[in-house]
Each structure stands twice: as C-alpha cells, then as structure tokens.
Interface confidence: low
C-alpha cells in the first residue's frame, strides 16, 4: 500500500474504469491488519485504526473482519480485491458505501466480515441491530 500522505494518483499502466467508463482512483481505507479490539456487543464500532492507506490497486475495496474467540476479540482492517476471496469468503457487499457486518460460519469462533467502497468506510463497522450474541457472557457496558 501507498503511505497515507501520498496524493491520489493513477499510473498509466494501472488505469481502471468503472461501469460508466470513468477512471476509478484507488480508494482510501483503514489498514491496520489484525489488532486486538474492545468492540463487543455494540451496534457499531470505530476501528481505532490510525493508519489510512491508499489501496495499491484501483479495484480494491475496504474490508473489516471482526473475530471473537474464548481468548480475545480482534479487528482486521485491510484493502482487498473483491474479485478474490478473503478468509475463504467472497466480498458480496463490496459496492456498499458502508461496512455492514455479516456473520460467517467459522468453527471455534464468532466471525463477522464486511466490505465497502467509500473512503475510510471500514473505520465505522456496523452490526445488524437484530443480532444477539449466542453466548452473552459479559455485560458490554462494563468491559467496553
């Protein structure tokens, strides 16, 4: 990825266009890879990632992955090409302007993933309000 302070630009050998033929510029995303998180049982969370990167490729979108197991909670923020699977899952919501978390089946952990295509959209991850954790083992308000 390109450092955050670098201006958006397009190399001639990397020009990508959207469906309307307009030039598609690389996107800005939060990119902290995997970090421990205190995001638990909330309707939405900020990533608390201080690194904003320009995605390497114009077609890449922002991705966030939230995982909870018996030991810890992590939040992963990256850029990724939606044509390629991530953690063995297709990025179905890559065109969404918001990062709406969807639960994926992973043995031994609770696993949510979202993708989105507006700048820094993976900074605010949104969980469905209807979702209830299957193991309500602690009161959010105490351990936020």
């Amino acid at each position: 990825t390109i450092p955050p302070h670098v201006q958006k630009s397009v190399n001639n050998d990397m020009i990508v266009t959207d469906n309307n033929g307009a030039v598609k510029f690389p996107q800005l995303c939060k990119f902290c890879d995997v970090r421990f998180s205190t995001c638990d049982n909330q309707k939405s969370c900020m990533s608390n990632c201080s690194i904003t990167s320009i995605c390497e490729k114009p077609q890449e979108v922002c991705v966030a992955v939230w995982r909870k197991n018996d030991e810890n909670i992590t939040l992963e923020t990256v850029c990724h090409d939606p044509k390629l699977p991530y953690h063995d899952f297709i990025l179905e919501d890559a065109a969404s302007p918001k990062c709406i978390m969807k639960e994926k089946k992973k043995p031994g952990e609770t696993f949510f993933m979202c993708s989105c295509s507006s700048d820094e959209c993976n900074d605010n991850i949104i969980f469905s309000e209807e979702y209830n954790t299957s193991n309500p083992d602690l009161l959010l308000v105490i351990f936020q």
Epitope: E129, N132, D137, L138, L139, V141, I142
Partner: antibody, heavy 121, light 107 residues
Framework: QVQLVESGGGLVQPGGSLRLSCAVS????????MSWVRQAPGKGLEWVSA????????ANTDSVKGRFSISRDNSKNTLYLQMNSLRAEDTAVYFC??????????????WGQGTLVTVSS | DIQMTQSPSSLSASVGDRVTITCRAS??????LNWYQQKPGKAPKLLIY???SLQSGVPSRFSGSGSGTDFTLTISSLQPEDFATYYC?????????FGQGTKVEIK
C-alpha cells in the same frame, strides 16, 4: 427459578472490612457477568463493581477503586465483594445482579433482595 | 461519566391515568437505555431494555421510546401495583449510570 441471595452485610466501623456474598441458583452462573449495585438510604441506585463470566476481568466505580474487590467462585455459584477501608458514605443496601449482554441489549436482571451495610462509629 | 436526568422527581396520579416519565442523557447513548421499577424494601425489577423492548412478563401497559439523548417511559393506564419508583439506566458506556428516580404516588 432464578435466585440471587446476598449475605454478609452488617454494622462496621469506619476503616473496617466486610465481605459480601451472593449465592446464585436457577441459571448457568459461569456464563454470565455479575455486578454489585448499591443504594444509600433514601437515595438512588449506583453501580459499584462487575466481573466477567470467567472472572478474568473486573471493573469498579471510581469511588471504590483500591478499596473494594469483586470476585467469584464458579464452582460454588457464588459472587463476592470484599470491602476494605469502609467509609460512612459506603452505607447502603448492596444488591447483586446478573448481567445480560447482546447487541443493543445490555441490562441488569434479575437482582437479589439486597444486604444492608452500615458504616458507623 | 454519562449523567442521566429524570423528570419529574415525583408525581401524583390516580388509577387509570396515563403516566409519562422522561429521562435525558448528557450525551447520545443510541438505544442503550433501560427502565427499572422499584418498590420500597424490594430489589429493582427490569421493565424495558434497549429503550423500547418490553422485558418478558412485564404488562403491556408499560412502554418505552426514544433514542439518542431523550427517552420516555409510559404507563398507559396506571394500576394500583404500579405505585413505585422508576429508574432509567444507560448501558452505553462505563460506568453504567442511573437516573435519580421518579416516585409515582397515589393522588
């Protein structure tokens, strides 16, 4: 049915110590965070301490930090509150309460009947 | 800490009356707001969680509404057993904080 029964309250002098217990039955104690909430005579409710299901995480309100310690014994289905360096302002009925957390759904329910702690010389 | 302010502090009403209690948070708490009922010498009882969800076993005359900073508990038709003190509580951030309570008395 679900029951939370507090004990250990009583009269203690300022600077003294007490240990409260909360015996739990009717639900899978080890799966839930637990809290202590107190109520001074004629006053409102104040959250005091909480502990995670596994007992590895605790939190306290500022006014009791360094003086009160919450713990639990999941094999005995019992919650504890060790209270040291007690002050007159700690005088209250102390309730234990089960914590429930899910997305958008975080509350104390049910509660025990409470035990009265009086700090006075 | 988030401050919770209830109004009124007390009110007098008759059986059958519609009663409304309001709760204001010092900052936005989304829908992380619970309501409890407490009778003298008894433990608090959960009525409403997540601002508007009725706890199992609570009569449907109790309802809650609001989001952000302003919330309301409504008793559509006051019954004799409803005379009690009502508390709101935010569960948005640590520490969880309660309103000062609203005492509903018989007129």
């Amino acid at each position: 049915q679900v029951q939370l029964v507090e004990s250990g309250g009583g009269l203690v002098q300022p600077g003294g110590s007490l240990r409260l217990s909360c015996a739990v039955s009717g639900f899978e104690f080890r799966r839930y965070a637990m809290s202590w909430v107190r109520q001074a005579p004629g006053k409102g409710l104040e959250w005091v301490s909480a502990i995670s299901a596994g007992g590895d995480r605790t939190a306290n309100t500022d006014s009791v930090k360094g003086r009160f310690s919450i713990s639990r014994d999941n094999s005995k289905n019992t919650l504890y509150l060790q209270m040291n360096s007690l002050r007159a302002e700690d005088t209250a009925v102390y309730f234990c309460a089960k914590g429930t957390a899910a997305r958008g759904k975080n509350y104390f329910d049910p509660w025990g009947q409470g035990t009265l702690v009086t700090v006075s010389s | 800490d988030i401050q919770m302010t209830q109004s009124p502090s007390s009110l007098s009403a008759s059986v059958g009356d519609r009663v409304t209690i309001t709760c204001r948070a010092s900052q936005s708490i989304s829908s992380y707001l619970n309501w409890y009922q407490q009778k003298p010498g008894k433990a608090p009882k959960l009525l409403i969680y997540a601002a508007s969800s009725l706890q199992s076993g609570v009569p449907s005359r109790f309802s809650g509404s609001g989001s952000g900073t302003d919330f309301t508990l409504t008793i559509s038709s006051l019954q004799p057993e409803d005379f009690a003190t009502y508390y709101c509580q935010q569960s948005y951030s640590t520490p969880p904080t309660f309103g000062q309570g609203t005492k509903v008395e018989i007129k």
